[in-house]
């Protein structure tokens, strides 16, 4: 039994990182393999993480951290029963792919104007909280080549965007994701969608020439 | 050994400043957030605020923001708050603790007497 | 922010007999990441606090086998299970899930 790949690692830099190897053959990861993981501090001991399947002969491993400073770094040992088949260490703050924003929410009845709110993913006592932008991305479920993205770069967790940008009478879903530029992060993954239905009351003009595009709220 | 060697007592007036320190021997305090905790003369434990010494990114307690400011010197592996516009209710034993993730090793605490 | 409410404030217990504490908090302290940062801290007379119990229920190294942490919720507990004289001292719950972090006002524990 020889590691193929060797286990490359993404922190969330809060409580997990996630670890993904390669084995040269098929492989029950959960029963043959384990993955022992130490930070190199005073008190720390040893944990055992008991790797899943990922493909035939992929592995990937949850890695449970209690807390994480940017100087942290953590040995890494695969074994497989008494056999020690790959040595090395990581450094969650190098390698950082941030936990995906939530409670994504479209408010539609400010007049005009769509404002998008969601969750940050981190509390306020983790670095990442004030350091993260964002990409909301939104698209029509009608027709494929209405898809947009808006970077926010402020803090903030919310996007207004005035309704009439999109087209009216027919349905949207947005999602929103994060990265870090203090540490040069990954994009976290796509919060999950919402859709909503869009609609406005045209300017007036408009409302006088093209009446039947007029919607109501 | 690991220790954490707090700056001795101070005698402040009113409205003055003071700056404590904490050196860490042992440890590197990069590994570690730094902690302050105020303990007022025959009173209990009172979370003040923490530093992560390599960003220097701190988080305070509300009702200690604008008074205290946690400040770190990786060179010296040494955390310092400094306290500011002191007053009567500012006087306390404050200790600079280490947590990694819990609050293992405490400095022998520094007096701070406000008085006019 | 989390209040900390230590019961009771003191208690006087005969060596070799057992001592109860009770700490609950305002609202849940499991921390986004699963965990739950309940800490119990003993402070001597003169002393700097010194940790116990980390994590609800995990004695920290050195820590006699005396002392155990159990709860969840909101609800924690710390127990000796034969108190010695060496006991004595102020006994702090804290939290450590959620900014700002808190402690219990303190329960003095004598020796009668």
């Known amino acids: 039994m020889k590691v193929l790949q060797e286990p490359t690692c993404v922190s969330d830099y809060m409580s997990i990182s996630t670890c993904e190897w390669k084995m040269n053959g098929p492989t029950n990861c959960s029963t043959e393999l384990r993955l022992l993981y130490q930070l190199v501090f005073l008190l720390s001991e040893a944990h055992t993480c008991i790797p899943e399947n990922n493909g035939g002969a992929g592995c990937v491993c949850h890695l449970l951290m209690d807390d994480v400073v940017s100087a942290d770094n953590y040995t890494l040992d695969l074994w497989a029963g008494q056999q020690l088949l790959w040595k090395g260490s990581f450094k969650p703050s190098e390698h950082v792919k941030p936990r995906a924003p939530g409670n994504l929410t479209v408010h539609t009845n400010v007049s005009d104007t769509l404002l998008l709110t969601w969750s940050n993913p981190y509390p306020p006592d983790n670095y990442l909280y004030n350091h993260l932008t964002y990409a909301v991305n939104i698209w029509s479920e009608n027709d494929p080549a209405d898809f947009r993205i808006y970077n926010v770069t402020y803090l903030e967790p919310s996007l207004r965007i005035a309704a009439s940008t999109l087209k009216s009478g027919i349905s949207y879903r947005a999602r929103v994701r994060a990265w870090a530029q203090c540490y040069n992060t990954t994009w976290s993954e796509w919060s999950p969608s919402t859709k909503w239905h869009n609609s406005y009351r045209e300017p007036f003009e408009q409302h006088h020439h093209h009446h039947h595009h007029h919607h109501h709220h | 050994e690991v220790q954490l060697v707090q700056s001795g007592a101070e005698v402040k007036k009113p409205g003055a400043t003071v700056k404590i320190s904490c050196k860490a021997s042992?440890?590197?305090?990069?590994?570690?957030?730094m902690h302050w905790v105020k303990q007022a003369p025959g009173k209990g434990l009172e979370w003040v605020g923490r530093i992560d010494p390599t960003n220097g990114y701190t988080i305070y307690a509300s009702k200690f923001q604008g008074k205290a400011t946690i400040t770190a010197d990786t060179s010296s592996n040494t955390a310092y708050m400094e306290l500011s516009s002191l007053r009567s209710e500012d006087t306390a034993v404050y200790h600079c603790v280490s947590r990694r993730p819990w609050f293992a090793y405490w400095g022998q605490g520094t007096l701070v007497t406000v008085s006019s | 922010d989390i209040v900390m409410t230590q019961t009771p404030l003191s208690l006087s217990v005969t060596p070799g007999q057992p001592a109860s504490i009770s700490c609950r908090s305002s609202q849940s302290i499991v921390h986004s990441n699963g965990n739950t940062y309940l800490e119990w801290y003993l402070q001597k007379p003169g002393q700097s606090p010194q940790l116990l119990i980390y994590?609800?229920?995990n004695r920290f190294s050195g820590v006699p086998d005396r002392f155990s942490g159990s709860g969840s919720g909101t609800d924690f507990t710390l127990k000796i299970s034969r108190v010695e004289a060496e006991d004595v001292g102020v006994y702090y719950c804290?939290?450590?899930?959620?900014?700002?972090?808190?402690f219990g006002q303190g329960t003095k524990l004598e020796i009668k």
């Open positions: 042992g440890f590197n305090i990069k590994d570690t957030y």
């Open positions: 994590k609800v229920t």
């Open positions: 804290f939290q450590g899930s959620h900014v700002p972090y808190t």
